[in-house]
């Protein structure tokens, strides 16, 4: 004969555990039913009566099978720098994430507690490491042969245009100005980060001689909430 299925509440066999979606009630010393997501225990089980469940009230939730006497409170409404990516329902908490142009400076289990605007690199500095959902932009000085003339949280240092004849030499915050009618721009992949080699045909001049190596990490600006550092703006 097949073993008889036990209905909750029931006393578990010594050494065995309760089944899925059941819990062991220490007071009743019985295996009792859990409540489904969106519900909570209104009446705990006894030796002869199973758990009585009730729906979570407005603005409260339970995400898992449970036997809690009270549902959890949904988080407060999302702030103006946030977007609600998941609404508060009886089965899930509200999730707030940062809106575009912002990153999460203080995260919580799900979503973000505190958003901060992404750092903007000022002219002469470009984005070394782009911002993510949870990290700020890192700025770095533009290396010789590259420039950035914008205040931006996305723009990287771009190579100076290569002139046949240079009218105004480029610097970290300004592109070179050519006198010839057809300037050429180097598209070498490494050119964004490294100074441009001078073409034997060009009269391109470097503003100041600097080592032609990529900047060391000491150029990178600190991450996290801090006063605007050199190369970044607070707005």
């Amino acid at each position: 004969l097949p073993a008889q299925v036990a209905f909750t509440p029931y006393a578990p066999e010594p050494g065995s555990t309760c089944r899925l979606r059941e819990y062991y009630d220490q007071t009743a010393q019985m295996c009792c039913s859990k409540c489904s997501p969106g519900q909570h225990a209104k009446v705990f089980c006894t030796k002869t009566s199973d758990t009585v469940c009730d729906s979570c009230e407005d603005s409260t939730y339970t995400q898992l099978w449970n036997w809690v006497p009270e549902c959890l409170s949904c988080g407060s409404r999302c702030s103006s720098d946030q977007v609600e990516t998941q609404a508060c329902t009886r089965e899930q908490n509200r999730i707030c994430t940062c809106r575009p142009g912002w990153y999460c400076a203080l995260s919580k289990q799900e979503g973000c507690r505190l958003c901060a605007p992404l750092r903007k690199c000022r002219p002469g500095f470009g984005v070394a490491r782009p911002g993510t959902e949870t990290s700020d932009v890192v700025c770095k000085p533009c290396a010789p042969g590259t420039f950035s003339n914008t205040t931006s949280s996305t723009d990287i240092c771009r190579p100076h245009q290569i002139c046949n004849v240079v009218a105004i030499p480029g610097n970290a915050s300004m592109d070179a100005v050519c006198t010839s009618t057809s300037p050429t721009r180097s598209m070498a992949p490494g050119a964004v980060h490294l100074p441009q080699p001078v073409s034997t045909r060009s009269q391109h001049t470097q503003p100041t001689p600097e080592p032609s190596t990529a900047p060391s990490t000491s150029f990178l600006l600190p991450m996290g909430p801090s006063p605007p550092a050199e190369g970044s703006t607070g707005d």
Epitope: A41, K42, V43, V52, P69
Partner: antibody
Framework: QVTLKESGPGILQPSQTLSLTCSFS??????????VGWIRQPSGKGLEWLAH???????FYNPSLKSQLTISKDTSRNQVFLKLTSVVTADTATYYC???????????WGQGTTLTVSS | DVQMTQSPSSLSASLGGKVTITCKAS??????IAWYQHKPGKGPRLLIH???TLQPGIPSKFSGSGSGRDYSFSISNLEPEDIATYYC????????FGGGTKLEIT
């Protein structure tokens, strides 16, 4: 309005049996999740849970006094009874009855009845 | 059985001040703790259940917190009517009261 009131003999001699009654109003023991329990407080000491009974007649007793205690109810008369056999002087105390919620804490209490055990 | 160690057993505080009482359980009680105020000649009065939920009608000057085995209860802005003995009750595994804390106000 929930109210509970305890009544008892006041004075007993050692070895006698204590019989207490809790009469309540404002709720019914036929309602799912309702329970009534007994707690005592010896003079100058703390509170001690003794026993309680649920709407479905499930009963719980303090393990250290289980052999001496019996709890019962009369649902239609809104009463719960407690018997404690073979009393000793250490059972001198104020005895309280209290309502239990479905999630097992005591939310309403009576004012208590005093028992003195003396020869 | 679950034992509840309540401390201090007595304390004195000044009007308008704040006091904190702690209860330590001998095992995890899953936040199933209640706090009561008890005055002579009356039955205990429920203040807080499930660690931090205020009973309806109880002022927010009373608060509770904790998890696992360690729980605390605070009263702020002390008034003369707060003079009483306070008890914790664990109801996660049968029922056990703490030893009580007698509060005096100076």
């Amino acid at each position: 309005q929930v109210t509970l009131k305890e009544s008892g003999p006041g004075i007993l001699q050692p070895s006698q049996t204590l019989s207490l009654t809790c009469s309540f109003s404002g709720f019914s023991l036929s309602t799912s999740g309702m329970g009534v329990g007994w707690i005592r407080q010896p003079s100058g000491k703390g509170l001690e849970w003794l026993a309680h009974i649920w709407w479905d007649d499930d009963k719980f007793y303090n393990p250290s006094l289980k052999s001496q205690l019996t709890i019962s109810k009369d649902t239609s008369r809104n009463q719960v009874f407690l018997k404690l056999t073979s009393v000793v002087t250490a059972d001198t105390a104020t005895y309280y009855c209290a309502r239990l919620t479905g999630t097992r804490y005591f939310d309403y209490w009576g004012q208590g009845t005093t028992l003195t055990v003396s020869s | 059985d679950v034992q509840m160690t309540q401390s201090p057993s007595s304390l004195s505080a000044s009007l308008g001040g704040k006091v904190t009482i702690t209860c330590k359980a001998s095992q995890d009680i899953n936040k199933f703790i209640a706090w009561y105020q008890h005055k002579p000649g009356k039955g205990p009065r429920l203040l807080i259940h499930y660690t931090s939920t205020l009973q309806p009608g109880i002022p927010s000057k009373f608060s509770g917190s904790g998890s696992g085995r360690d729980y605390s209860f605070s009263i702020s802005n002390l008034e003369p009517e707060d003079i009483a003995t306070y008890y914790c009750l664990q109801y996660g595994n049968l029922w056990t009261f703490g030893g009580g804390t007698k509060l005096e106000i100076t």
